[in-house]
């Protein structure tokens, strides 16, 4: 009986037309929501004038429906048993699941000022930037609506720059009408243990952002894993949001709508400094901000963001070193709310529930030549927002899953 079930599972998890896996893979049957909490800065003047700690107050959730679009340009390659695709991006605001509207205002770090002063470190260039910042009446902080902050706004300072630059700024700009990929993944036809594992991303097996093994594209995209998952496994997956591959380890057995699933979590070790976890040495890309690679819990992804000083962390700097959160007041990290987990049905390897949590931060540094940054006495990794992207198998799908998969085995 077990062999027959195994055979059936192997057949149904292959990524090709006609299988259960393929149908749900092309267009997820799960409703996925992305909730945002914005860190509203309470004391912008004190920070700018006296280099005080930044006092933040999170406001949210502001919820969007995401991942509702079917994969595009799905192309099978029979020769190497892969399927390639684009994952289109789309976000629809959900007012009923939000605390306010997209027009709500927030005081946040001036993204353009922080980024430009980091990218252009030559003193003369900074003097030009300073005159444009002053001319545009820009400052270290700015007031922006949620819509502007997430999806883009025309920056008044960048609009004055006398050479070609992108003048539209936004944490997720551009998003709607764009796509992630091309991904090329193994379809599992020749070897089911490779199903959904990424072969190439954007035509390459490496990212070109990191040194050594850190640059590898490992595992799947976390939507599913090869079948027959064991608790002892370390599940590797690639996340384009954080520009790196990462891994999850088994934490506990969970019952999800009558389906036994394994909860895999991202361990604190994945965010550790190379001192504690030598494997992470290649995620430390500079020595000053990282205090000689002893800081932990923040990932400098500037190389992946055209040099903009973007740092990714867990929400509220969960699992981060004290020096990172020390200049920020108002953060309360806790595992339950702020860690990332995947609930995986072990027989099929399908992720039936997940919560992906991450925080977007921007580095701002003192600058002798930029007036609005002149009084800063230290570097700040400034939290801008954190997000919680969740998806749970629907009741109908869960019933179908119980009857067709777990029910048959039990």
């Amino acid at each position: 009986g077990d062999l027959l079930i195994q055979k059936t599972i192997k057949k149904q998890v292959v990524l090709e037309e006609g299988t259960i896996a393929f149908k749900n893979w092309v267009k997820t049957g799960t409703e996925v929501y992305r909730q945002f909490w914005i860190f509203d800065v309470q004391n912008p003047q004190e920070v700018m004038m006296n280099s005080s700690n930044i006092q933040v107050k999170q406001r949210g959730p502001y919820t969007y429906r995401v991942r509702f679009l079917a994969k595009e340009n799905v192309t099978q390659d029979a020769e190497d048993n892969t399927v390639s695709f684009l994952q289109p991006n789309g976000a629809i605001f959900e007012p009923s699941l939000s605390v306010g509207t997209e027009a709500d205002n927030f005081t946040v770090l001036n993204l353009a000022v922080a980024a430009a002063s980091h990218i252009y470190q030559n003193q003369f260039v900074q003097m030009i930037l300073n005159s444009l910042i002053n001319k545009s009446k820009s400052s270290m902080f700015q007031v922006r609506t949620l819509r502007e902050l997430l999806w883009g706004y025309r920056d008044p300072f960048l609009s004055l720059v006398p050479y070609p630059v992108t003048t539209t700024v936004g944490l997720f700009y551009p998003y709607n009408n764009t796509a992630d990929g091309v991904y090329k993944v193994f379809n599992g036809k020749d070897n089911i243990s490779k199903v959904a594992i990424i072969d190439t991303y954007k035509g390459k097996r490496n990212l070109s952002y990191w040194e050594s093994h850190c640059d590898m594209i490992n595992g799947t995209d976390a939507a599913s894993f090869p079948p027959f998952v064991e608790k002892s496994q370390v599940l590797q997956f690639f996340s384009s949001d954080i520009c790196r591959s990462i891994y999850a380890v088994f934490e506990s057995d969970v019952n999800l709508k009558g389906i036994p699933v394994y909860r895999f979590v991202l361990p604190s070790k994945a965010f550790a400094s190379p001192v504690e976890n030598p494997d992470n040495y290649c995620f430390c890309t500079e020595k000053i901000i990282s205090k000689n690679c002893t800081s932990y819990g923040v990932l400098d992804i500037s190389k992946c963001k055209e040099g903009r000083p973007v740092y990714i962390s867990l929400p509220h700097f969960l699992y981060a070193s004290p020096d990172v959160s020390e200049p920020i007041d108002g953060l309360n990290p806790n595992e339950e709310e702020h860690r990332t987990y995947l609930d995986i049905e072990p027989i099929t390897g399908f992720t039936l529930q997940f919560a992906k949590r991450l925080q977007v931060n921007l580095l701002v540094k003192p600058s002798e030549k930029i007036q609005v940054l002149k009084n800063l006495k230290r570097n700040y990794i400034v939290p801008i927002l954190w997000l919680n992207e969740t998806g749970t198998i629907g009741d109908e799908k869960a019933n179908m899953f119980r009857s067709q998969v777990t029910g048959k085995i039990n």
């Epitope: 030559n122 003193q123 003369f124 030009i128 050479y163 002798e368």
Partner: antibody, heavy 117, light 107 residues
């Protein structure tokens, strides 16, 4: 060794234009800005403007805005300054200079421009 | 535009004497003052950069001090090779501006 090699002396007629070159070597051209400085005979130094080789962005002193055009050729690590509508007032020695974290740390040898009919 | 007033215009000193040149700026430029030496037929040479920093290879008899709007350049024991024109340059605001220069001669 960092070097800035300027083009030779120029004798031009009033109303004409002239283009002075500044060929750099011994460092990464795009990591520093290039500036131009005017020194009239027996007089002080006057900053004309500077250019960012990386993207061609520039800034000028107001009274040189319509007089001087600054350009670069990244492929040959060369900076250029074109001066137009020349008058006898433009007769001077023109220097190019490099600036990084320090103001004008290396200079070209200077180009003498004489405007005379 | 920040104007830079340099004094004196000329200076005649004996070998071994202490030389002092002063520059005053019309706006506060923190410590963004630079000092140059220029000998006849040569381009200016950077001696001291922002923050009163002596450039590598420059003899320690040269020094500077000052912050805000008032700056002083000093040669502790003048040598014959120090005969030259000296200029201050403010690099705190655009446009950069030079002082009018000081001609240093031997008495």
């Amino acid at each position: 060794e960092v070097q800035l090699q300027q083009s030779g002396p120029e004798l031009v007629k009033p109303g004409a234009s002239v283009k002075i070159s500044c060929k750099t070597s011994g460092y990464t051209f795009t990591e520093y800005t290039i500036h131009w400085v005017k020194q009239s005979h027996g007089k002080s130094l006057e900053w004309i403007g500077g250019i960012i080789p990386n993207n061609g962005g520039s800034s000028h002193k107001q009274n040189f805005k319509d007089k001087a055009t600054l350009t670069v050729d990244k492929s040959s690590s060369t900076a250029y300054m074109e001066l137009r509508s020349l008058t006898s007032e433009d007769s001077a020695v023109y220097y190019c200079a490099r600036a990084g974290d320090y103001a004008f740390d290396y200079w070209g040898q200077g180009t003498t421009l004489t405007v005379s009919s | 535009e920040t104007t830079v007033t340099q004094s004196p215009a000329s200076l005649s000193m004996a070998i071994g004497e202490k030389v002092t040149i002063r520059c005053i700026t019309s706006t506060d430029i923190d410590d963004d003052m630079n000092w140059y030496q220029q000998k006849p037929g040569e381009p200016p040479k950077l001696l001291i950069s922002e923050g009163n920093t002596l450039r590598p290879g420059v003899p320690s008899r040269f020094s500077s001090s000052g912050y805000g709007t008032d700056f002083v350049f000093t040669i502790e024991n003048m040598l014959s090779e120090d005969v030259a024109d000296y200029y201050c340059l403010q690099s705190g605001t655009l446009p950069f501006t030079f002082g009018s220069g000081t001609k240093l001669e031997i008495k």
